[in-house]
């Protein structure tokens, strides 16, 4: 009979935590150095040897006395039942076809964990089992007492099981859910006595595959691979994850230190194609994702360096930079952005090998700019580098615009006092820091006579005392580079304050809408002038320049306040640059009720009448245009006299009201009174909005008819 190659020295050990049987055996009768393919048939039985629950053929290559290993994971916790294992072997090798028959079975190796349990009346298994949600799990209890009826509960709900033997009951849990990080609670208790046991089944959330797996290089020396790990397993300590990178062309592998990125050293042998497998693994499962790419297509360049802004003039500047090389023949595409006041105002793309250069034109003088540059692989765009940014300020240039100039002319003791005002130039007009203003006085009666005044910035005006002659005044703004164009205004010997009728205007939310008649002669423009703080000695004079074809404008200002009267003057500017008054307008941005009442004097008291008079008071100080007056008269009489009507006061008292609708009227005769009668009166002005405040009534008693005798 041919020599059979049988498995020998079979040992079975257990791993309770993993519910595994580990088998170890060897084949002794192999010749030295002989290596044969063999197949081993393994049988596992439960409770009794006749109850075979698993049969498997395991193929491997065998050497003499080599220790062979095989493991089996049991669905049922090993503590729940006695298990037995046996095996036999056969050669499955073309070298020795004559040996292709099964050897004898080994004897049954018994594994009985129950015998090693303690003396407690009740045990529940598995302990500390860790599974993924959706799994099926088998649980059992082992009871030491036949008499006791045992009930088991999953999270408080009774489970129904099958009896394996009188002491063991098995429960099959299907599709277990994740409940909480502390696990799922299972309790078993006996009907009699106080025997109770609990176990925790740790259910993790499904281990997801890594998302957004991507690799890139910045220098063609190191690849940086990143990914987003799957969502948290939901358990505190049980599940640690490991990440491994494997590259199939080189056959290299690395264990990643971090859970969301890993570095890979690029092969020095100019390997271009990379085929990565990222494997995420925890106790329960592995997840893999793949990535195939050409290294040169995944270049994320480093930020440009040695970035300078040179040759900065008032309107131009040159930006230069260097780029980090990404291989001998590669070209980078660089993007330049120019920022002014926080906004991109120029954008340009430039191709660069090593050194980059770009001229920025059409810049504003004396202006702060920021220029930034970033680069990407021009041949195979992957990602832009980070920006490298430089701030610079252009040089100053001479101011580009003449100052906006206005004047106020007063006649004082035979002299002309001219107050000159000018508005500061805008940043765009000034082209630098304004250092001083030059005021040149040219006497038009003696043209060769010029007088120069230099006024340091930031002054916005000056006062000149001139004789009665005509002058032309030139004003320029000056910075470190040069002088602005001149603003010219003329002053004639005549102050030009001719009498002009004042017209009322009504303000709106948008401001005052002013209009005027066009002038028949040559006009170079118009100026509208007003005070933003009327009544204030400083006044805060404002003006607005308008073109020669303009006959209306809206004057608006945040300074306009309700109840304040604003006076506007409209001037025409002659071809000789002399302003002359055309029109006057006055109005309120919003009228209010009168703020106070006039003082009233009573006279000519008779038995049948009395006269009231009141002083005119400054219309300017009123918070609206006074349209007339209301006179309130109280008496014992039930009916109101002719010319008056019944009125109810704010204190609900009833009286008679006379309406005086001429604002210029300053006297009023109250007639048709009764002799020896008691009266009370009160006078208040009214505007378009309403009446003034209610004040105290003045008492008066008419004399009887005969008191004069």
């Amino acid at each position: 009979e041919p020599l059979s190659l049988a498995p020998e020295s079979l040992e079975v050990s257990i791993d309770s935590a993993r519910q595994c049987l580990h088998l170890k055996w060897s084949v002794h009768n192999l010749a030295y150095h002989q290596e044969l393919k063999m197949v081993f048939q393994i049988e596992i039985s439960r409770i009794k040897t006749s109850n075979v629950i698993w049969v498997e053929n395991y193929s491997t290559t065998v050497k003499r006395n080599q220790v062979l290993r095989w493991s089996w994971e049991s669905k049922l916790p090993l503590e729940c039942a006695k298990h037995s294992v046996r095996m036999r072997g056969a050669v499955d090798d073309a070298q020795v076809p004559e040996l292709r028959f099964w050897s004898n079975w080994t004897s049954w190796e018994e594994v009985d964990v129950q015998s090693s349990l303690g003396h407690d009346p009740l045990f529940v298994f598995p302990k500390d089992k860790l599974v993924e949600e959706g799994s099926n799990v088998t649980i059992c209890y082992v009871s030491r007492s036949h008499q006791n009826n045992i009930s088991c509960y999953l999270e408080g709900v009774r489970m129904h099981g099958e009896q394996l033997d009188p002491n063991v009951c098995v429960f099959h849990l299907k599709n277990v859910p994740f409940i909480r990080e502390t696990g799922t609670n299972i309790y078993c208790k006996a009907d009699q006595g106080d025997v109770i046991k609990g176990i925790v089944l740790f259910v993790s959330k499904v281990f997801e595959e890594p998302k957004d797996f991507s690799c890139e290089t910045r220098d063609l020396k190191t690849l940086n691979c990143t990914w987003a790990p799957g969502s948290d397993a939901g358990l505190l300590t049980q599940l640690s994850q490991s990440y491994t990178l494997f590259e199939s062309f080189s056959g290299k592998k690395t264990l990643c230190k971090y859970k969301s990125w890993c570095n890979w050293q690029v092969s020095p042998d100019s390997q271009e194609m990379y085929n990565f497998t990222l494997t995420a693994e925890n106790y329960l499962r592995k997840r893999s994702v793949h990535l195939l790419f050409n290294l040169t297509h995944r270049v994320h360049p480093m930020a440009p360096f040695n970035v300078f802004v040179k040759n900065v003039s008032a309107t131009n500047a040159t930006m230069t930079w260097k780029v980090h090389s990404i291989g001998n023949y590669s070209t980078l595409l660089c993007q330049i952005e120019l920022y002014g006041e926080g906004k991109v105002i120029q954008k340009q793309n430039v191709s660069v090998k090593v050194n980059g250069k770009h001229l920025m034109k059409k810049l504003e003088p004396s202006t702060e700019y920021a220029a930034q540059v970033r680069c990407a692989n021009a041949n195979h765009f992957w990602k832009w580098s980070e920006w490298t940014r430089r701030n610079f300020t252009t040089a100053e240039a001479a101011p580009s615009e003449a100052p906006d100039v206005w004047r106020n002319v007063k006649s004082v003791q035979g002299h002309c006092v001219v107050t000159l005002f000018w508005k500061p130039l805008s940043k765009l007009q000034a082209n630098g820091k304004i250092l001083f203003y030059n005021v040149v006085l040219e006497n038009l009666d003696r043209p060769s006579t010029l007088k120069l005044l230099s006024i340091p910035a930031p002054a916005n005006g000056t006062e000149l005392t001139l004789d009665r002659c005509s002058y032309q005044i030139h004003v320029t703004a000056n910075n470190s580079v040069g002088t602005s164009p001149a603003s010219v205004i003329a002053v004639s010997g005549d102050p030009g304050n001719k009498e002009v009728e004042e017209e009322r205007v009504k303000g709106t939310e948008d401001g005052f809408c002013l209009s005027w008649k066009p002038q028949p002669g040559d006009v170079t423009g118009y100026v509208v002038e007003w005070c933003e703080r009327p009544g204030d000695p400083l006044c805060d004079l404002q003006w607005k320049n308008l073109g020669p074809n303009t006959t209306s404008t809206v004057v608006s200002s945040d300074a306009f306040r309700p109840g304040v009267r604003y006076n506007f003057r409209i001037y025409g500017i002659s071809t000789e640059r002399i302003p002359y008054l055309l029109e006057k307008k006055t109005g309120y941005s919003q009228e209010l009720v009168p703020s106070d009442n006039p003082q009233v004097l009573m006279s000519n008291l008779t038995s049948y009448s009395f006269t009231l008079s009141w002083k005119d008071y400054a219309a300017e100080s009123q918070p609206g245009f006074v349209q007339g007056y209301s006179l309130y008269l109280k008496s014992k009489a039930a009916r109101c006299l002719p010319g008056s009507e019944k009125a109810v006061l704010s204190d609900d008292s009833i009286c008679c009201k006379y309406k005086i609708d001429n604002p210029k009227q300053k006297t009023f005769v109250v007639e048709n009174l009764q002799p020896a009668s008691f009266y009370e009166f009160f006078l208040t002005p009214y505007t378009s909005v309403g009446e003034g405040p209610q004040g105290a009534f003045t008492k008066v008693t008419t004399p009887d008819e005969y008191s004069h005798i």
């Epitope: 303690g118 407690d120 302990k127 408080g156 909480r180 502390t182 696990g183 609670n185 609990g198």
Partner: antibody, heavy 117, light 107 residues
Framework: EVKLVESEGGLVQPGSSMKLSCTAS????????MAWVRQVPEKGLEWVAN????????YYLDSLKSRFIISRDNAKNILYLQMSSLKSEDTATYYC??????????WGTGTTVTVSS | DIVMTQSHKFMSPSVGDRVSITCKAS??????VAWYQQKPGQSPKLLIY???TRHTGVPDRFTGSGSGTDFTLTISNVQSEDLADYFC?????????FGAGTKLELK
């Protein structure tokens, strides 16, 4: 009879160490989770730490993790709590408790630890 | 950390009364709640686990109820031996946390 008996506590200086032990009897010790819970006089209970059946997994109150170590010797049926860098706020009665799961069905009588200079 | 709030520090029923001790979790703890009784000078004793399951040997006048965030331990027909501190405990998330306790004292 199921019993848990803690070792004697005592008075210790702040910054020093102390090891508590708890001897179990009347049940199969290795078949249960075990825990330490402490109680400040007239105050509530505070969970300190848990340990699984074979000591392979431990769970702690975060603020104590760096100073306290829970361990067990299943051969001797003893649970330990090694406490280091003790502070005055660690003064309490320390109970050893048996876990049904994370709930505690058997408690020791408690031992008093006083941390004071 | 999950905070377990026992709003009543003291309750004073008479013998034979029915008393409800409440406990509120700061976030959902499902039914992972236990109740303990601690008599003066003694160790705590488990009464209820999984919110409503009575532990072995606990008289049936003790009943637990609730899920999510609101839990109640009800003692019907209060006896003088029920005078004690009562604590709730959550074991849904680490760290395991206890309520501050409710002291039951007879009127």
């Amino acid at each position: 009879e199921v019993k848990l008996v803690e070792s004697e506590g005592g008075l210790v200086q702040p910054g020093s160490s102390m090891k508590l032990s708890c001897t179990a009897s009347g049940f199969t010790f290795s078949d249960y989770y075990m825990a330490w819970v402490r109680q400040v006089p007239e105050k509530g209970l505070e969970w300190v730490a848990n340990i699984n059946y074979d000591g392979s997994s431990t769970y702690y109150l975060d603020s104590l993790k760096s100073r306290f170590i829970i361990s067990r010797d299943n051969a001797k049926n003893i649970l330990y709590l090694q406490m280091s860098s003790l502070k005055s706020e660690d003064t309490a009665t320390y109970y050893c408790a048996r876990g049904l799961t994370w709930d505690f069905d058997v408690w020791g009588t408690g031992t008093t630890v006083t941390v004071s200079s | 950390d999950i905070v377990m709030t026992q709003s009543h520090k003291f309750m004073s029923p008479s013998v034979g009364d029915r008393v409800s001790i409440t406990c509120k979790a700061s976030q959902d703890v499902d039914t992972a709640v236990a109740w303990y009784q601690q008599k003066p000078g003694q160790s705590p004793k488990l009464l209820i686990y999984l919110a409503s399951t009575r532990h072995t040997g606990v008289p049936d006048r003790f009943t637990g109820s609730g899920s999510g965030t609101d839990f109640t331990l009800t003692i019907s027909n209060v006896q003088s031996e029920d005078l004690a501190d009562y604590f709730c405990q959550q074991y849904s998330r680490f760290p395991l946390t206890f309520g501050a306790g409710t002291k039951l004292e007879l009127k």
